[in-house]
Interface confidence: low
């Protein structure tokens, strides 16, 4: 199709070589074309937009994304040619940064419903470049944490070195939805709740004498509780003796609850004590069985193919540890009578 009629938007992605970050393009269809696809919803807070920004379509899977090769070849379907780019409804997600993402991206409705819709498309010229060392050394991260129950803020990485007074007007999105009241380079959250978690996008306009473009950054925000002050506790086994049948297989489970830590290095292992000897058992891998904001429950089993007389003289010890300290629970096997 002829892309000469598409509205054009220029975007800049300056990525940090020190960290992993993602990027998104929205299929921001133009205002004037009040067709099935190309109208912006003017909605009150009760009528939250049904779709990602500015889409009027009934079904966002009706949007098609293309890349325009620089050598003048025909448009390429994004889904077929670029595995590191994912189309999610009318948003294009770039999973890895790199200058090779630079180029022209076109989106348009799959179904053209009237003659006026032919030019209902957007061409986004994306320039991608690494952040220079001369740039701000302490720019905000693309992964930010908010402490639940406290006051916090989300900073726009590309503007975090500027004072609020110098900062241009910023457009913010959360999970693809426009946050219309936020215009500064920092969103201040009076009281952090778990629903403040999500993917935030901040845009601002930069101009030179020739043209203007949108500078965009993506921030993954996580809501967290404060680091635990407690060592892990063992939920199972509770008893220090376990009745068993000789010659039968046996699985003993160790379940431990670890409080939240930003830097989380949980240890859970089994070892066996036999008179003066002590050795660790290479048992199946530990697995997380429940994860919440506050804590994580991790389980690790020890498997005996069959219980022997020797096992009755041994102690099976579950050892768990976090950065605060460790806890152990030992189990002595006892032959079941009768």
């Amino acid at each position: 199709f002829n892309i000469s009629g598409c509205s054009t938007k220029k975007l800049l992605w300056t990525y940090s070589t020190r960290s992993e970050e993602e990027f998104v393009l929205f299929c921001d269809l133009p205002e004037p074309q009040k067709s099935h696809f190309c109208h912006r919803n003017r909605l009150s807070p009760k009528q939250v937009p049904e779709h990602l920004p500015f889409m009027g379509s009934n079904d966002l899977s009706d949007v098609q994304w293309y890349q325009q090769p620089s050598n003048g070849d025909p448009l390429e379907d994004i889904r077929k040619s670029y595995p590191h780019i994912i189309q999610d409804k009318c948003t294009l997600h770039f999973l890895t940064p790199g200058v090779n993402n630079s180029g022209s991206y076109i989106c348009r409705p799959k179904m053209i419903k009237s003659p006026y819709d032919v030019a209902c498309c957007v061409k986004m010229i994306l320039e991608v470049k690494p952040q220079t060392n001369a740039s701000c050394e302490y720019s905000a991260s693309h992964k930010q944490d908010l402490l639940l129950g406290s006051t916090g803020s989300i900073s726009c990485p590309s503007l975090s070195c500027q004072s609020d007074a110098q900062s241009p007007a910023v457009t913010w999105y959360k999970n693809g939805k426009l946050l219309s009241v936020e215009r500064s380079n920092r969103i201040v959250v009076d009281e952090v709740y778990d629903y403040h978690q999500g993917t935030y996008v901040c845009d601002y306009t930069q101009s030179d004498t020739v043209s203007s473009w949108t500078v965009r950054a993506v921030v993954q925000v996580r809501t967290i509780v404060g680091d635990t002050k407690l060592k892990p506790d063992i939920l199972d086994p509770v008893e220090d003796t376990l009745e068993v049948e000789l010659g039968k297989p046996l699985t003993i489970s160790c379940k431990a609850r670890f409080g939240f830590e930003r830097v989380f290095n949980p240890v859970i292992k089994w070892y066996i004590k036999d008179s003066d000897l002590e050795w660790e058992v290479s048992v199946p891998e530990a697995k997380s069985i429940k994860s919440t904001l506050k804590d994580e429950i991790i389980e690790r089993n020890i498997i005996l193919e069959k219980v022997t007389q020797r096992d009755l003289r041994r102690k099976f010890v579950c050892f768990v540890q976090n950065s605060i300290g460790n806890t152990t629970q030992s189990v002595q096997l006892k032959e079941k009578r009768g």
Epitope: P45, K46, E50, H51, L60, K89, G176, V189, Y193, Y195
Partner: antibody, heavy 117, light 110 residues
């Protein structure tokens, strides 16, 4: 809009699945919640499902209900109904981000479930 | 878990009068409160969110306010159509994902 279906008279212990059909918005972008109301009583929240986080349940509802979804419907399965589960069951869009909080809107008209032997 | 205590259970007021319904949260929930109106045989309808913001299409006769953990819904210039049961709802999700509603207030218009 949202609309519930599947409510009927059911014997205690017989599993029952209610369906909420949505139109005009995508379940990819919104969560859908279930709330019930016993005859002459108040509103009781059961749980919600969304594409990102899966299903979440009120603490009292865990194990008693299962919420699942397709592209345009959300099901609520009452795993083993008792007479206390006799109620009108509503589905509602939400929670979603609006002014930094979660609300339920719109609601379906409700479907009546009667559990009796 | 948060508990929402709604008072009174029932109130009867003449047309043109004013009704005040209160909702007390057992702990701080910030401004995370919504009010719903439910008429007999109908589903609830959102009136107010974020304690004081009027939902789309709702008459300005409905007013929500907050003082600490106490929330108030005021209906002024009462009309016959306002006869309904009103529920408050804490809209903040804690880890348990319980979403507490108040017990409801029946408004009778004389």
């Amino acid at each position: 809009s949202v609309e519930e279906s599947g409510g009927r008279l059911v014997a205690p212990g017989t599993p029952l699945t209610l369906t909420c059909t949505v139109s005009g918005f995508s379940l990819n972008n919104y969560a859908l919640s279930w709330v019930r109301q016993a005859p002459g009583k108040g509103l009781e929240y059961i749980g919600f499902i969304n594409i990102i986080h899966g299903a979440y349940y009120a603490s009292w509802a865990k194990g008693r209900f299962t919420i699942s979804k397709t592209s345009t419907t959300v099901d609520l399965k009452i795993t083993s109904p008792t007479t206390e589960d006799t109620a009108t069951y509503f589905c509602a869009r939400g929670p979603y981000y609006v002014g930094s909080e979660y609300v339920f809107d719109p609601w379906g008209p409700g479907t009546l479930v009667t559990v009796s032997s | 878990d948060v508990v929402m205590t709604q008072t009174p259970a029932s109130v009867s007021t003449a047309v043109g009068g004013t009704v005040t319904i209160k909702c007390q949260a057992s702990q701080s929930i910030g401004g995370s409160l919504a009010w719903y109106q439910q008429k007999p045989g109908q589903p609830p309808n959102l009136l107010i969110y974020s304690a004081s913001n009027l939902a789309s299409g709702v008459s300005s006769r409905f007013k929500g306010s907050r003082s600490g953990t106490e929330f108030t819904l005021t209906i002024s210039d009462l009309e016959c159509a306002d006869a309904a049961t009103y529920y408050c709802q804490c809209t903040y999700y804690d880890d348990s994902y319980d979403v507490p509603f108040g017990g409801g207030t029946e408004v009778v218009v004389k």
